[in-house]
């Protein structure tokens, strides 16, 4: 299993939207991809979950564009705020 986030950093103005890319490799038949936000304290905050057999997930300002064939799961954060400045991680799980 492998997860790759190629964007090391990205900058966008407040109120707009940003898309964070994540590619993965897995041999699992059924799985989930999770997106987390890491606070300065290093605490990880869960944002949204995408199931391998589910339609694109959406929760408020967070939405996922899931392309199973391409093994891509991009997170879009819209209505950006200064408080969104942080490190974002995607994770793969069964």
């Amino acid at each position: 299993q492998k997860v790759t986030q190629a964007q090391s950093s990205v900058s966008m103005p407040v109120r707009k939207a940003v898309t964070l890319n994540c590619l993965y490799e897995t041999s699992w038949w059924s799985y989930y991809i999770f997106w987390y936000k890491q606070l300065p304290s290093k605490e990880m905050i869960f944002l949204i979950r995408q199931g391998s057999d589910e339609q694109n997930a959406k929760s408020g300002r967070y939405s996922v564009n899931f392309k199973k064939a391409a093994k891509s799961v991009a997170l879009t954060i819209s209505a950006l705020q200064l408080e969104d400045s942080a490190k974002y991680f995607c994770a793969l799980g069964e």
Epitope: K16, G60, R61, A79
Partner: antibody, heavy 118, light 111 residues
């Protein structure tokens, strides 16, 4: 289930003050920007004020700038609107709304009524 | 400020037919490929309800008979087929820049 419940409205004399509250539940309040929007009787919608999740960014409509103050208490999941120097034209239903995708207002409270009259 | 002009101010549509509401912005509400235009429905005595965000995205739980289109300065809300429960006032709203602004509203009557 997302819920927003406004309170604090009432009848105030011109020049008076009032503080509105909006109690939020069913979502991570500290992760969302919040707005106040008002609607005068038989009129359209007018945006009033915005506060970001951690209160770092605040905007006001020109019509209320210097008179209204938006604030929030993330520990208590509550949004506030302090209104001073009230005028008859501030008479309206006041709604709090959550800022959703693409800065839309995806959830609204039922509103609280402010009447400014002598 | 971005001024939003809705037309018509009111319209009457027969049950099952199409209702089309236009919203024109005084300047573009697009940014980086996204259109920051949203549509709301408001029934008497109720708060507004989000129908469409970012010009064409249907909000969760909203029937597929509602659709939005447009970019730049010209946007359209379509309802087809219209149902009795769609009688309401509809507002467009731009969120591209401060201050957030609303159109004047369009009152839909079902014949």
């Amino acid at each position: 289930e997302v819920q927003l419940v406004e309170s604090g409205g009432g009848l105030v004399k011109p020049g008076g003050s009032l503080k509105l509250s909006c109690a939020a539940s069913g979502f991570t309040f500290s992760d969302y920007g919040m707005h106040w929007v008002r609607q005068a009787p038989e009129k359209g919608l007018e945006w009033v004020a915005y506060i970001s999740s951690g209160s770092r960014t605040i905007y006001y409509a020109d019509t209320v700038k210097g008179r209204f103050t938006i604030s929030r208490d993330n520990a208590k999941n509550t949004l506030f609107l302090q209104m001073t120097s009230l005028r008859s034209e501030d008479t309206a239903m006041y709604y709090c709304a959550r800022e959703g995708a693409y800065s839309s207002f995806d959830y609204w409270g039922q509103g609280t009524t402010l009447t400014v009259s002598s | 400020d971005i001024v939003l002009t809705q037309s018509p101010a009111s319209l009457a549509v027969s049950l099952g037919q199409r209702a089309t509401i236009s919203c024109k912005a005084s300047q573009s509400v697009d940014y980086d490929g996204d259109s920051y235009m949203n549509w709301y429905q408001q029934k008497p005595g109720q708060p507004p309800k989000l129908l469409i965000y970012a010009a064409s995205n249907l909000e969760s739980g909203i029937p597929a008979r509602f659709s939005g289109s447009g970019s730049g300065t010209d946007f359209t809300l379509n309802i087809h087929p219209v149902e009795e429960e769609d009688a309401a006032t509809y507002y467009c709203q731009q969120s591209n820049e401060d201050p957030w602004t609303f159109g004047g509203g369009t009152k839909l009557e079902i014949k």
